[in-house]
Structure formats: structure tokens, C-alpha cells
């Protein structure tokens, strides 16, 4: 009887081991199938649109990442409140699961646009390095479904890179003119969004709780029109210490106003950055490593 019980235990352990191995094989097969599917759909560096079919709807890129899709590219997502799905670039590097909300890379897109364009989004949603603004509506839908971290990757023309990260990034609704809310800063580029770098500056240069402005919808704290003068849509105050939607110049520039792609705490007002990526991911994101 004792021998029988021992044999049962041994067989149970063996079954568990086999189940684990089968599960591992299933995961491996799923990954290989996905990679194969992605390679088939991925047209090299230029076209990175990845069609997952109608397998399921994803609220953001972190869900896609945790469902086993580890290749960066354009995917379709549908945040909880969003009436329709839309295309977005998912950055599956840097820990993975990043939803890219803005990109500047070469000045190929015009960012001097009106309220409707900034509301709905515009740009190149096909090419890997395509410039775009995801749309204030979409930013609102995304950032109200849970608490997000915003990471901003910045690069200059001298091959230097810095980043700024903000917890609890939120964009308000249309009624509140897509107001910006950000939490605790960390990073290497300095805190230009909250304007914490200088007490004299914070009240007029901070972007915290600023409403979004465009040339045709002025919600800034300035007697003039920041968006018109700086030729971009942004959360202007009076006017800015950061403007990542500014005019694309090649490094140092001169203009009537500081209208370049500016991150004051790194390169000041008179240097326009080479590239910018604004991307978000849930605060509590844990990569699914199974």
C-alpha cells in the first residue's frame, strides 16, 4: 500500500513536469508563430505596421507586450473609453510596452496645426521613424483608464541622449481643453515640464495644469498667442520651458521667438533638438516574462 502511494506521488510529479513542459512548448510555439507572422507583415525598417487581426482588443501597448508580442511597430489599440480603435507605435524595447504618443525625427511633418488636427491626431502612422501626434482625444482616452508614466527620450545633434520621466501623466477631456497633469519627475534632462528648475520661473513656465493651445484656440496665460508665435500646439503657459512640438531646426537657431523643439533644462531656448519620443506605460507595468 505504501509502495502504491509512493508510485502515485511519483506519477503525479511526472505529470506536473510534463504539463509544465507542454506549457513551455505552447508558449514557445505561440512566440514563434507570432514572430513568423510579424516577419511576414513587417516590411523592414520602412513599413512597420503589424496587423494582429481581430484576435482581441488591446487598451494600450503594454497589454500587447504582455500578450507575447515583443516586436516594435504600429499596432491597433482601443482604450476603454475610446469609441474606435486607432494605430499607434509600440516601443517594445526599453523594458517594453510603451505607447508612443509623439515623435519628432526629421521635420517631415508640419506641427503648426489647428485645434482639430491636434485633437484628432496627425502624421505618419506607417514608418518606423515617422513623425506624429497621437491626438489629444486619444491621449485623454488612454490616460484616464489607469495611471501612466510618461517617458520623454531626447537626442541632440551631437549624438547625446537624455530622458525625462513623469509619473501620473494625465490629459483632461475636451471640456477642460485637454489639460496636462504630471506627477513626480525623474531623469537626466532636467524638469522642464513642471518648471521646477527655478523658483522664479515656475509660475509662468510650468506646463503643469496648463490647457492645450493652438493658433486658433488660445488658452495660455499670455497677453498674446503663444501657439501662433511658436508655431505649434502645446500646453503653453506664458509661454514655455519645454515645447516638443516646435519648429524643426538643426541645432542652434535664431528666430523672433524661441520656437524650436525646446527642452530648456538641457539645451536652453535657442537649441532645437534632433529627435524626441514621448511614450507612456502604466505606472505599475510588470513585463510578463512567461
Amino acid at each position: 500500500l505504501e509502495d502504491c502511494a509512493q508510485e502515485q506521488m511519483r506519477l503525479r510529479a511526472q505529470v506536473r513536469l510534463l504539463e509544465t513542459r507542454v506549457k513551455q512548448q505552447q508558449v514557445k510555439i505561440k512566440q514563434l508563430l507570432q514572430e513568423n507572422e510579424v516577419q511576414f507583415l513587417d516590411k523592414g525598417d520602412e513599413n512597420t505596421v503589424i496587423d494582429l487581426g481581430s484576435k482581441r482588443q488591446y487598451a494600450d501597448c503594454s497589454e500587447i507586450f504582455n500578450d507575447g508580442y515583443k516586436l516594435s511597430g504600429f499596432y491597433k489599440i482601443k482604450p476603454l473609453q475610446s469609441p474606435a480603435e486607432f494605430s499607434v507605435y509600440c516601443d517594445m524595447s526599453d523594458g517594453g510596452g510603451w505607447t508612443v504618443i509623439q515623435r519628432r525625427s526629421d521635420g517631415s511633418e508640419n506641427f503648426n496645426r489647428g485645434w482639430k488636427d491636434y485633437e484628432n491626431g496627425f502624421g505618419n502612422f506607417v514608418q518606423k521613424h515617422g513623425e506624429y501626434w497621437l491626438g489629444n482625444k486619444n491621449l485623454h482616452f488612454l490616460t484616464t483608464q489607469e495611471d501612466y508614466t510618461l517617458k520623454i527620450d531626447l537626442a541632440d545633434f551631437e549624438k547625446n541622449s537624455r530622458y525625462a520621466q513623469y509619473k501620473n501623466f494625465k490629459v483632461g477631456d475636451e471640456k477642460n481643453f485637454y489639460e496636462l497633469n504630471i506627477g513626480e519627475y525623474s531623469g537626466t534632462a532636467g524638469d522642464s515640464l513642471a518648471g521646477n528648475f527655478h523658483p522664479e520661473v515656475q509660475w509662468w513656465a510650468s506646463h503643469q495644469r496648463m490647457k492645450f493651445s493652438t493658433w486658433d484656440r488660445d488658452h495660455d496665460n499670455y497677453e498674446g498667442n503663444c501657439a501662433e508665435e511658436d508655431q505649434s500646439g502645446w500646453w503653453f503657459n506664458r509661454c514655455h520651458s519645454a515645447n516638443l512640438n516646435g519648429v524643426y531646426y538643426s541645432g542652434p537657431y535664431t528666430a523672433k521667438t524661441d520656437n524650436g523643439i525646446v527642452w530648456y533644462t538641457w539645451h536652453g531656448w535657442w537649441y532645437s533638438l534632433k529627435s524626441v519620443v514621448m511614450k507612456i506605460r502604466p505606472n505599475d507595468f510588470i513585463p510578463n516574462v512567461i
Partner: nanobody, 127 residues
Framework: QVQLVESGGGLVQPGGSLRLSCTAS????????IGWFLQAPGKEREGVSC????????VYADSVKGRFTISRDSAKNTVYLQMNSLDPEDTAVYYC????????????????????WGQGTQVTVSS
Amino acid sequence: QVQLVESGGGLVQPGGSLRLSCTASGFNLDFYTIGWFLQAPGKEREGVSCISNSGGSSVYADSVKGRFTISRDSAKNTVYLQMNSLDPEDTAVYYCAALAGRGCMRSPITTDEYDSWGQGTQVTVSS
């Protein structure tokens, strides 16, 4: 409140030059739009010139265009008003004023936007 100090005023002959300085201690003038104003005896204070917080934009009153030049020296935390071809009508007390953030993008230069003022420096143009 920003503490501003003007200097460089004095007595000068017609056709002569002066350079006025506006200096702030303990504050970074780069963060402020700076305006120069004059007040002649018995008259209202009026705008002469201004320079935006980031230094990209400057505006001049019609009466001084081509004669006066406004500039900044960030290292010295000072804004200058270089005045050439001075005329007896330029005689006045000259004030500098600060406005936090963006400003000075259009004419005319009005006093109401500016929130911090210096004590003024006297400029007398006479032979």
C-alpha cells in the same frame, strides 16, 4: 518682486551717446522680458524699447528706431540700452521694468504689462 537698478545716465551733448544698464541682483534676467521707458517732466511714462525673455525679439518706439539698441548680457545679468544721436527731446528719467515670461512681441510698448520697476536714471541732453 524683482529688484532692478538702472545706471549709466548723465549729461550729454546733442548728437552724443550713452549706454544705460539695467541690472538685477539675485534674479536671472534671462527669465524676464525687459522694457525701457522714459518719463519727461510733466508727461506720461512711455515705452522706448523692450527685449523678450529669450532674447529673440526686440521692439522699438518709432521715435528711437535706428538710434537706440537694446541687448542682453546673460553672464552679467544685465540688459543694456545703447543710445546714439541723442537729442534734447530725449531728456527724461529712464526706467527699466521686468515682465515674467514671454512679452515684447509687438508695438506699442505699454506700461501695464510690466510688474517690477527700477528707480530710474536721469538722462539730460543739453549743450
